[in-house]
């Protein structure tokens, strides 16, 4: 049928809980394209009418909620004037228990996310809500270890928990709690945060100065193999520490499965007033879902973040 | 529509105390914070605080700790937001503004202010 | 606390032509979230702030599409790609990305 297959990462979701996709493909859906869902190679696009518990949402797929029988893989198709693109998602639907639900504790969780606060630093942990226009988002609720989070450390600012002076005790199981109200009807949302902390790198005051990356971004085809350093000078005698993060994540943490985008070994120059470290990162293959994302190069306490872009299309 | 309406001018003595309200409507008060942005005679825009009707929750600027405290009154939708010893430099348009939604920030909803002059 | 700086201080513009206003914070505002907690609003004489772009490049409900935004975690660019009489006043940068919210002094906007 003429149309280009290109395959995302599987999501893993909980029942009984709304989720959304977005059929997003930078180069292609900011033009004059249509984009229908199907599941399971099926010729019969999903229903476009919002009272159906599954449905297509402008470019997203809407499940209020999510069920069971709702595993499997669907693909959406963009049609531009002179293209086809076919993107398949992979959804596996599983039951999870964040705390006992028999004694009053939070119901089920979505797919756990994996975040880093930084010891001594005011942080913030962030609850992932993705869903269409379509969608009002209401109030919400974080907990930890299953009881809601209070106190004067602690700030509930649109989709974020600040965290002011953030200690070891804050480690541990988080949650956060939004009501979602879809054509008059509420639904709830809950999503599962492990929450790790990360040492404030360094001893009084040396400020690491990364040289390259410079927050910009980097075009790159698709499917290719790509490697970019971080340089970064410290001085002789830092103990600060150096890393690439997605997510908030070690990339070797993030892609630990299909080891797909990896850390390297760090390596380092020494001058007479400072060293010169070195650390890449190496994208065996990129893939869609790496455009648009932050990749961010860590030292101590400076950041530094590239982001793919695909390269503009070439008319001549 | 969501609408946030202020209560009138004031002219206070330094050392005075100044209760500003700013009663809300068109939305369910308890969900979102009333935030506090104060502008002096041709100077820029200043965050003061933000208060929570829900839990009565504050989180102000260190510059304000000591001297502003946010009340609000439910029954009313009305938030206060209360400055103690005043001082000339205290003379300025105070706002309360509310975010753009409980998860996009911004403001999108501001008061019509109200001038509080300090003067002898 | 997170300092805006902007500039220029003033910006006398001709009606139909474009301007082009900058702010620099002095902390990257790019959560590892991918959101970038930045902020424009424009203050008309004698009324409050009116949001025009949120989380640094979407557009506030009702504001024309002349208005945009773009930058870096630490470098932002207004453009206005056609300036209106209307669009005159005070621009203001802003940051929620930690607390205390911090504005920039902002930018007069005059027409010529």
């Known amino acids: 049928d003429g149309c280009k297959d290109i395959f995302m990462k599987n999501e893993i979701l909980s029942a009984s809980q709304p989720f959304a996709f977005n059929c997003t493909f930078p180069p292609i859906t900011s033009g004059e394209v249509s984009v229908t869902w199907y599941k399971n190679s099926s010729k019969i696009p999903v229903s476009k009418i919002i009272q159906s518990r599954i449905h297509q949402d402008e470019t997203w797929i809407l499940f209020l909620p999510m069920e069971w029988g709702d595993s499997g893989v669907y693909q959406c198709v963009i049609k531009g004037r002179d293209s086809c693109h076919r993107i398949h998602v992979n959804l596996t639907v599983f039951e999870k228990h964040w705390c006992d639900t028999s004694i009053g504790g939070l119901p089920n969780l979505s797919d756990e996310y994996k975040q880093i606060l930084h010891l001594g630093k005011d942080d913030s942990l962030t609850c992932h809500l993705h869903f269409p226009k379509s969608c009002v988002l209401g109030p919400i609720k974080w907990y930890k270890d299953c009881n809601e989070i209070k106190g004067e450390r602690f700030t509930v600012l649109e989709t974020r928990l600040l965290v002011s002076n953030v200690s070891a005790e804050d480690r541990g199981n988080y949650a956060c709690q939004a009501i979602l109200t879809h054509s008059g009807k509420q639904y709830e949302v809950l999503n599962g945060i492990t929450v790790s902390i990360t040492e404030r790198a360094g001893y009084g005051g040396s400020v690491p100065k990364i040289i390259y990356p410079k927050n910009h971004s980097i075009e790159v085809q698709l499917g290719t193999t790509l490697i970019v350093d971080c340089n970064v000078t410290d001085t002789k005698d830092n103990t600060n520490l150096r890393c690439w993060r997605v997510n908030n994540t070690l990339v070797d943490d993030y892609y630990d499965e299909s080891k797909r985008i990896r850390e390297g070994v760090e390596t380092h120059v020494s001058f007479r007033e400072h060293n010169l470290y070195t650390v890449n990162i190496t994208f065996l293959e990129v893939k869609m879902e790496d455009y648009g994302l932050p990749f961010m190069c860590h030292a101590g306490v400076s950041t530094a973040y590239i982001i793919l872009q695909l390269p503009a299309p070439d008319f001549r | 529509q969501v609408q946030l309406v202020q209560s009138g001018a004031e002219v206070k003595k330094p050392g005075a105390s100044v209760k500003v309200s700013c009663k809300a409507s068109?939305?369910?008060?308890?969900?979102?914070?009333m935030n506090w942005v104060r502008q002096a005679p041709r100077q820029g825009l200043e965050w003061m605080g933000m208060?929570?009707?829900?839990?009565?929750?504050?989180r102000l600027n260190q510059k304000f700790k000591d001297r502003v405290t946010m009340t609000r009154d439910t029954s009313t939708s009305t938030v206060y937001m209360e400055l103690s010893s005043l001082r000339s430099e205290d003379t300025a348009v105070y706002y309360c503004?509310?975010?753009?939604?409980?998860?996009?920030?911004?403001?999108?909803?501001w008061g019509q202010g109200t001038l509080v002059t300090v003067s002898s | 606390d997170i300092v805006m700086t902007q500039t220029p201080l003033s910006l006398s513009v001709t009606p139909g032509q474009p301007a082009s206003i900058s702010c620099r914070s002095s902390?990257?505002?790019?959560?590892?979230?991918?959101?970038?907690?930045f902020y424009w609003y424009l203050q008309k004489p004698g009324q409050p702030p009116q949001l025009l772009i949120y989380?640094?490049?979407n557009l506030a409900s009702g504001v024309p599409d002349r208005f945009s935004g773009s930058g870096s975690g630490t470098d932002f660019t207004l453009k206005i790609s056609r300036v209106e009489a209307e669009d005159v006043g005070v621009y203001y940068c802003?940051?929620?990305?930690?607390?205390?919210?911090?504005f920039g002094g902002g930018t007069k906007v005059e027409i010529k």
């Open positions: 902390k990257s505002l790019l959560h590892s979230n991918a959101i970038t907690y």
């Open positions: 802003a940051q929620n990305l930690e607390l205390p919210l911090t």
């Open positions: 989380q640094m490049s």
């Open positions: 503004a509310r975010t753009t939604s409980m998860i996009i920030g911004g403001f999108a909803y």
């Open positions: 068109g939305y369910t008060f308890t969900n979102y914070w």
């Open positions: 208060f929570h009707p829900s839990n009565a929750v504050t």
